[in-house]
Amino acid sequence: TGADTEAVVCVGTACYTAHSGKLSAAEAQNHCNQNGGNLATVKSKEEAQHVQRVLAQLLRREAALTARMSKFWIGLQREKGKCLDPSLPLKGFSWVGGGEDTPYSNWHKELRNSCISKRCVSLLLDLSQPLLPSRLPKWSEGPCGSPGSPGSNIEGFVCKFSFKGMCRPLALGGPGQVTYTTPFQTTSSSLEAVPFASAANVACGEGDKDETQSHYFLCKEKAPDVFDWGSSGPLCVSPKYGCNFNNGGCHQDCFEGGDGSFLCGCRPGFRLLDDLVTCASRNPCSSSPCRGGATCVLGPHGKNYTCRCPQGYQLDSSQLDCVDVDECQDSPCAQECVNTPGGFRCECWVGYEPGGPGEGACQDVDECALGRSPCAQGCTNTDGSFHCSCEEGYVLAGEDGTQCQDVDECVGPGGPLCDSLCFNTQGSFHCGCLPGWVLAPNGVSCT
């Protein structure tokens, strides 16, 4: 493929590989992709240090690179037609494997705006200077190259492969050689963490003449989030060396028997795990690492812990302390939401009360219901409110419009309703006549 020497660093749940070869960004991405990865992300200072470590490993193996200022592709690219955005840390570029924009960046210089062609990012290494953790490789953007024409000073690329988990390297208790074959087709005899689904071939002995045993193991998930080889006890043990070779392959203590045999042991506060080599803290929660209201939860076999928050709280960035969740951001209420410590409260607008289908729902208050009507006479319920009405001969009165006041028909706007005398009554009126006159059948005229 044109990609030669490689170096590998595995840490956390990812492995980084560095390759030398004058390839275009597309060819480099294709190379990473074929083995199940992508061109590397550099999403934090820590990740930049991992990438720097793998590049340093590669440079130690490479005799001489052609350019003093060498460039290595990473997975940061900007598609044609997508313009520069100076307000963002990634300036409008995005990681080839997807994922959100990240706050970390380490640009070499101010970027020029150009939307007419695809742009790709490489790490700029000054080979005249030693690679120091304090001086992380700068990001350089430029054309992405094409087959046979990778671009000036392009010397290689860095891939990243992510895994469910990692196994500890196998412990040898005597002379031998371990060869790890990773899922991304790299072989190595020195990995500080070995990715899930890797194979380990162990050849015991000091040379061909001595070689007596060989073992084959796979890094597998033995229980949820517990990754192990399934080997039991140190490998390649030899009475000739006892505990003197690599501490017998033991994680902490090695105890020799008189017959050249030995056993692994653990310091106070630790216990020996099923592999009979590794020691784990008896109870990582005993040091009370979780703060505030967080509870310490042990992982399987007491190997690790996480902090867990009570309902309504979530872990902060330290993963050790709890902060209140603002449940109101998810709009759980039909009308008003009030965030409270550890929870929230739904409230209803005036004229509504809690109820109806679904949590946090509000239903109209029937202000006109029997026994609660605020109106002196007629009451009509409306959505979220109500209105009062009055019987004939009365008009709405009062500041809140709930009272009914008698209409004085005798002084009505249409003038006198009676020909002679007018008597106002509650809600009505009647006419009368002067002495010697009689009220006519129409109840208005006097005859």
Partner: antibody
């Protein structure tokens, strides 16, 4: 589709051994744990061991350690369970079961009845 | 070993009615990764067991949605919203958090 086909019923004398086979098909045999579960007549389910065919790694229920041996032949995608020093209480139906990526036992063999009787 | 107690031992149900089975564990099945490693299996008469629910609340492929699982770290419930005749059999809860994997004693669901 995933299938686990077990060998036929066995009748054994106390103190003898029995070897039950389980032929897998329809999935990558080497990459999944294969569990063995037994069920005594009218009783519940009891897990007694598992094997990872990829490298032959095994785990056993402490209750049976020393009497049970699990093996796998990758070339024929067949797993074997051998139980020695049989006693009458080993009379049960023995199931081979695939363990999936969610730690569930998702595919079960049809079961092999082993009867231990003098 | 993680020990579990399943109840009831027997559960007679009228078709169309809901049913509920409980399972209590001697220690929490909640892993530090936030997943609860609790499983439910059904063994129909004369058949091998079949997976119903994985990781406490996820329905296995092909299982009708009248089945549901819920619970906390140590107490779990399998619910059937409306029992059908085909649901008869023995229901087992199980844990796959720590070796040895263990099963509950079983609950026999029968039609009234």
């Amino acid at each position: 589709q995933v299938q686990l086909v077990q060998s036929g019923a066995e009748v054994k004398k106390p103190g003898s051994s029995v070897k039950v086979s389980c032929k897998a098909s329809g999935y990558a045999f080497s990459s999944y744990w294969l569990n063995w579960v037994r069920q005594a007549p009218g009783q519940g389910l009891e897990w007694f061991g598992r094997i990872y065919p990829g490298d032959g790694d095994t785990d056993y229920n402490g209750k049976f350690k020393g009497r049970v041996t699990l093996t796998a032949d990758k070339s024929t995608s067949t797993a074997y369970m051998e139980l020695s020093s049989l006693r009458s209480e080993d009379t049960a139906v023995y199931f081979c079961v695939r363990g999936d990526g969610y730690w569930a036992m998702d595919y079960w063999g049809q079961g092999t009845t082993v009867t231990v009787s003098s | 070993d993680i020990v579990m107690t399943q109840s009831p031992l027997s559960l007679p149900v009228t078709p169309g009615e809901p049913a509920s089975i409980s399972c209590r564990f001697s220690q929490s099945l909640l892993h530090s990764n936030g997943i609860t490693y609790l499983y439910w299996y059904l063994q129909k008469p004369g058949q091998s067991p079949q997976l119903l629910i994985y990781q406490m609340s996820n329905l296995a492929s092909g299982v009708p949605d009248r089945f549901s699982g819920s619970g906390s770290g140590t107490d779990f419930t399998l619910k059937i919203s409306r029992v059908e005749a085909e649901d008869v059999g023995v229901y087992y809860c199980a844990q796959n958090l720590e070796l040895p994997w263990t099963f509950g004693g079983g609950t026999k669901l029968e039609i009234k």
